[in-house]
């Protein structure tokens, strides 16, 4: 019977007695970066092309023995996972591999950099169609190896790599860390965070996604028809390369971001169970497993858009923190979370000809987040209308005036320190969705787009009596593209978008009164966009 | 283009040896093994074992009964199939083919094995 | 050892006939199955691989279906230079086995 891996990825309609998907991505080259391998084991023969690349570090111990089988093993398993004929994910992929682990599993940061190199190269030499990059592997934190990373994606070259296997945030890893590669966590069967005896997955807002990642049966390089089960980030990783394959082969125009948003978007939402996170990675932690999309393709008429959290911004008293979204995503809101709720807004504003979203933490605060809505718009003209403190007892409000530009997120951020303190909430009059409003005090941010056939509404959701947490969802059809709080509820901690939900958290609710200050209203903003339906149409 | 090329017909008595090669070329060595596979006159085809040009690891056929020696010379890209205490019933035509998908084949070497 | 059985053993056909050549396993061996052409005095030549996926080079009159333990090699229309024995071939599992061959020829 099929695997549990392979099912938990596979959506209801692929799903049979066997796992055969439409397609096992025949266009597309996957790289794997890792130990040596089998290449001519029955599960993977013809399929992996190992190129004369070998930098790897002598093995540790006077007495370490070289058993090829041992040597072999990861790269082997991992190579099955991607594209075993039986046991794989992409079975039409074809792989090379690059040889950066020794032995022991161990690598080095140049070896792993000129392996990056060597890719480089070779894809000027000799380009074929989408690549793939697998980095099954995880080390300190790497400026030097970030870079890298971000200079080959940005050569149009899918990086997907492993969490790391040490129960820790991803962020503090290489290549984990970097913003342009494709991290993944692992989940096991039941669809919690894989413990790996006293340790476990990363996770953190460096996470991406998760996949299979605990009891997945591949290649075993014991013999040339073995198969055996291994756990951890990498056969995670090798999953998600692998569905990155089969995606790029059913649309090989797809672009990084493109590819990065639809992976999320058909995801299995909600499935963790978060308790096992650190209580202050949680909120941090995609809630997302991986799977294939039902069909590969007809997805191009959905505006697609992503949560991205800075990292935290640190105690001091003008602290910011700040979130960009990747160059070909559009920012199109803003929004700001603090534990303590001690913050001072968050705007947006241009840094380098591109907006990005920044946090302001507040005297005696903790420390704050910036949480960028970042999506994908094509064509978009999005500019930032701001309207300074109003003074004035209505409130300060900003709105999209230019002709054809729509609403997509309203920020706001103050200078005072105890902004909204006793004072009553300022409420949105009726009739006017088209604008942000706030606190006399505050200044208020709109984000106004004008992409083809975008077209936004707001929805809210209100409480009166004091609550840990509010939220609103936008309909099906519609993406949730801003995400705030109406002013006036002094207890709020921030808001944030998990998929298509808005969420607005406030202080624990029994410090908080049930006065009208216990209120709190959660805004979403709601957009679609009819030309991408449009143009979907005409190509089917 | 992919290639497998065979030794030369080989006429034995009963209780030689013989030792068939196949030199290949035209693909990466490592990414297949060779599949060894016979078929006796007028007869179908035999799966004799599989031999990996990577490590040298070998997989065989129960039927061999420990008389069978398959290995690999990388340097000339050559594998081998040694056969020993020959018997009548041995005479065939033995292929070797890429793999265990077997997609490429030899053109064949006939072992006559006559008194 | 899976077992793999052909039938029908030989069939007589002519020119432009439809042919259909079926193959039973002795227990499931997903889609690792192969058909091959094989000519007198000629090494097999890999017809389908996977079960249903032709090589490059492969006529398109020549094709393969099944799954599990049933497969079936099909030939749309019978051309002259198809006369021939065929056979089907699993790999699932060593040792990798044939079935006994399907001899096609001219009515």
């Known amino acids: 019977s099929i695997p549990w891996n392979l099912e938990r990825i596979t959506p209801p309609r692929y799903r049979a007695d066997e796992y055969q998907p439409p397609d096992g991505g025949s266009l597309v080259e996957v790289y794997l970066l890792d130990t040596s391998i089998q290449s001519d084991h029955r599960e993977i023969e013809g399929r992996v092309m190992v190129t004369d690349f070998e930098n790897v570090p002598e093995e540790d111990g006077t007495r370490f023995h070289r058993q090829a089988s041992k040597c072999d093993s990861h790269g082997t398993h991992l190579a099955g996972v991607v594209s075993g004929r039986d046991a794989g994910v992409a079975k039409g992929a074809s792989m090379r591999s690059l040889r950066v682990l020794n032995c022991q599993g161990k690598g080095t940061v140049s070896g792993t950099l000129i392996g990056l190199e060597f890719i480089r190269k070779s894809q000027l030499v000799q380009p074929v169609g989408p690549l793939v990059v697998l980095l099954p592997l995880a080390g300190g934190y790497s400026r030097v190896l970030n870079a890298a990373c971000q200079r080959l994606a940005r050569a149009g070259v899918v990086l997907v790599t492993a969490a790391g296997n040490f129960r820790d945030d991803a962020c503090l890893y290489s290549p984990a860390s970097a913003p342009e590669v494709i991290t993944v966590g692992a989940t096991n069967a039941q669809d919690q965070p894989v413990t790996l005896g006293t340790l476990g997955t990363n996770f953190g807002r460096c996470v991406d996604l998760f996949a299979p990642g605990e009891d997945i049966i591949g290649a075993s390089s014991d013999c040339s028809t073995c198969f055996v089960s291994q756990s951890g980030t990498s056969q995670a990783a090798a999953h998600v390369a692998g569905i990155a394959a089969m995606m790029l082969s059913a649309e090989p125009e797809l672009t990084l971001a493109e590819l990065r948003q639809r992976l999320i978007h058909f995801s299995a939402k909600d499935v963790i169970n978060e308790a096992w996170f650190p209580e202050d990675q949680r909120v941090l932690t995609p809630n997302l497993v991986a799977a294939l999309p039902p069909s590969t393709h007809g997805a191009g008429w959905q505006l697609f858009c992503r949560t991205v959290w800075s990292a935290h911004s640190g105690p001091t008293r003008m602290a910011t923190a700040v979130a960009r979204c990747a160059p070909d995503e559009e920012l199109l809101s803003c929004s700001s979370f603090s534990r303590s709720g001690k913050r001072r807004g968050e705007r947006m504003e241009a840094q380098g000809g591109k907006l990005v979203c920044r946090a302001h933490n507040a005297f005696g605060g903790e420390g704050v987040y910036a949480i960028a809505r970042c999506c994908l718009l094509p064509q978009a003209n999005c500019s930032v209308h701001t309207a300074p403190p109003a003074e004035a007892s209505m409130g300060t409000r900003v709105h999209c005036h230019q002709q054809g530009h729509v609403l997509t997120g309203c920020s706001s951020h103050w200078e005072v320190e105890d902004l909204g303190t006793h004072k009553p909430p300022v409420l949105r009059p009726r009739g006017q969705p088209n604008q942000c409003v706030g606190h006399r005090e505050a200044s208020i941010h709109a984000s106004c787009c004008h992409a083809p056939g975008l077209e936004c509404k707001v929805k809210e959701h209100g409480i009166p009596a004091p609550q840990e947490q509010v939220t609103v969802a936008c309909e099906e059809g519609w993406t949730l593209t801003g995400c705030s709080a109406l002013p006036g509820t002094s207890h709020v901690l921030g808001a944030y978008a998990v998929d298509n939900t808005c969420v607005v958290r406030s202080r624990d609710v029994s410090t908080t009164g049930s006065t009208s200050e216990g209120a709190v209203t959660a805004v979403a903003i709601c957009c679609r966009s009819r030309h991408l339906a449009q143009a979907s149409q005409e190509l089917q | 283009q992919v290639q497998l090329v065979q030794s030369g017909a080989e006429v034995k008595k009963p209780g030689a040896s013989v030792k068939v090669s196949c030199k290949a070329s035209g693909y990466s060595l490592t990414s297949y093994g060779i599949s060894w596979v016979r078929q006796a006159p007028g007869q179908g085809l035999e799966w004799m074992g599989w031999?990996?040009?990577?490590?040298?690891?070998?997989n065989y056929a129960q039927k061999l009964q420990g008389r069978g020696t398959m290995t690999t010379d990388p340097s000339t890209s050559t594998a081998y199939m040694e056969l020993r205490s020959l018997r009548s019933d041995d005479t065939a035509v033995y292929y070797c083919a890429r793999g265990f998908g077997m997609d490429r084949w030899g053109q064949g070497t006939t072992v006559t094995v006559s008194s | 050892d899976i077992q793999m059985t052909q039938s029908p053993s030989s069939l007589s056909a002519s020119v432009g006939d439809r042919v259909t050549i079926t193959c039973r396993a002795s227990q499931n061996i997903n889609n690792w199955l192969n058909w091959y052409q094989q000519k007198p005095g000629k090494a097999p030549k890999l017809l389908i691989y996977g079960a249903s996926t032709r090589p490059t080079g492969v006529p398109s009159r020549f094709s393969g279906s099944g799954s599990g333990t049933d497969f079936t090699l099909t030939i749309s229309s019978l051309q002259p230079e198809d006369f021939a024995t065929y056979y089907c071939?699993?790999?699932?599992?060593?040792?990798?086995?044939f079935g006994q061959g399907t001899k096609v020829e001219i009515k």
């Open positions: 031999v990996s040009f990577y490590n040298g690891q070998t």
């Open positions: 071939q699993q790999w699932d599992d060593t040792p990798n086995t």
